[in-house]
């Protein structure tokens, strides 16, 4: 399988909320026997291996805001701790996760990596990650809204932040 | 919370089999990770046993394969040890516990543990 | 198997002060850029308690003076400063490869 990000940069205004999003795709496998751990963390760029480092997320490590199910279930993070932080992490039935970070300031800027993990017993896993750039902006410069610019093409979209 | 709690007996003749069981609350077994067995020496030296797959395979330390078994009753969320042909050697504090993945895997929780005797 | 070598076996450390506890495994046991290292901390009459996982991450609700730190062979736990509470028999255990092991504790006394 691989991860796909469906937008390779988002431009925020401050204050807004912005959803990142990450995709799954190719053969899942559903088995009794197959866990996917799921996460998001931070990362800098100029790395020799994109997404190698791992840093939290405002103060919340890859551990919190982890999600761990099944192949075929849906999951969230604990809502209690993330949303104290303005976040929540999900995942769908249909292979998307995402998370969504409420009232962007200019400290959210910066590189964020998914990750899915592929765990089968007895502890083999497999990793595939994506990564995307978050950029907040002040000023008269800044967007009204989220533009997203997707990974394959140039192409923006204007989206409305929910 | 999840809980863990071992339960079994105190104390067991030579070449007889030893059974305890894991009594698992606040979490299903089938939806977690992989559910293990370790045991406490009294010099205090720890060693893994083996554990049960959420999907109920098994793993087993190579040093007791031939001797020991691994099952789980779904229905009432436990799981469970089978020592066969023991040995003074044997005796130990018996842990169950939990793994967790974190670009690891760990034990992150843990029974409180029962004390097995091998004695006749 | 992997052999956990753990030094000192016992040390005592004033209040206040750093403890340093090491743990050398007979063969590398990362993956992928992660340690597959662990630190536990056991008091008489406990099960052992989760302080570090991945040779470096603190455990949810585990205090800040705990810090683990290394790669490949080499992994070390840094207690500082202590605390009265923290005497205790601190373990490690890799869980690269099967079957998983422990090292042989380092007994921590406050002075």
């Known amino acids: 399988f691989k991860v796909a990000t469906p937008y390779s940069l988002y431009v925020c205004p401050e204050g807004q909320n912005v959803t990142l999003t990450c995709r799954l795709l190719g053969p899942v496998d559903k088995g009794h026997d197959v866990t996917f751990y799921k996460t998001w963390y931070r990362s800098s760029r100029g790395e020799v291996q994109t997404c190698s480092e791992r840093r939290p997320i405002r103060n919340l490590t890859f551990q919190d805001l982890h999600l761990h199910h099944g192949g075929h279930q849906a999951a969230n993070t604990s809502h209690d701790l993330a949303q104290r932080h303005g976040l929540e992490s999900a995942s769908d039935h249909h292979g998307n996760f995402s998370i969504t970070m409420r009232n962007l300031t200019l400290l959210d800027s910066g590189l964020y990596c998914c990750l899915v993990v592929e765990i089968r017993h007895h502890h083999s896993e497999h990793r595939v990650h994506g990564a995307m750039e978050l950029q907040v902006q002040t000023g008269k410069d800044a967007p009204s809204n989220c533009v997203v610019y997707p990974s394959s093409s140039q192409d923006s979209e204007n989206i409305t932040a929910a | 919370d999840v809980q863990l709690q071992e339960s079994g007996p105190d104390l067991v003749k030579p070449s007889q089999s030893l059974s305890l069981t894991c009594t698992v609350t606040g979490y299903s077994i089938t939806g977690g990770y992989n559910w293990h067995w370790i045991r406490q020496f009294p010099g205090n030296k720890l060693e893994w046993m083996g554990d049960i797959h959420k999907s109920g395979s098994t793993n087993y330390n190579p040093s007791l394969k031939s001797r020991i078994s691994i099952t789980r009753d779904t229905s009432k969320n436990q799981f469970f040890l089978q020592l066969n042909s023991v040995t003074t050697e044997d005796t130990a504090t018996y842990y169950c516990a939990r793994d967790y993945y974190g670009f690891s895997w760990y034990f992150d929780v843990w029974g409180a543990g029962t004390t097995v005797t091998v004695s006749s | 198997d992997i052999v956990l070598t753990q030094s000192p076996a016992s040390l005592a450390v004033s209040l206040g002060q750093r403890a340093t506890i090491s743990c050398k495994a007979s063969q590398s046991v990362d993956y992928d850029g992660d340690s597959y290292m662990n630190w536990y901390q056991q008091k008489p009459g406990q099960p052992p308690k989760l302080l570090i996982y991945?040779?470096?991450n603190l455990e949810s609700g585990i205090p800040a003076r705990f810090s683990g730190s290394g790669s490949g062979r080499d992994f070390t736990l840094n207690i500082h400063p202590v605390e009265e509470e923290d005497a205790a028999t601190y373990y490690c255990?890799?869980?690269?490869?099967?079957?998983?092991?422990f090292g042989g504790g380092t007994k921590l006394e406050i002075k």
């Open positions: 255990q890799q869980s690269i490869e099967d079957p998983w092991t």
């Open positions: 991945g040779a470096s």
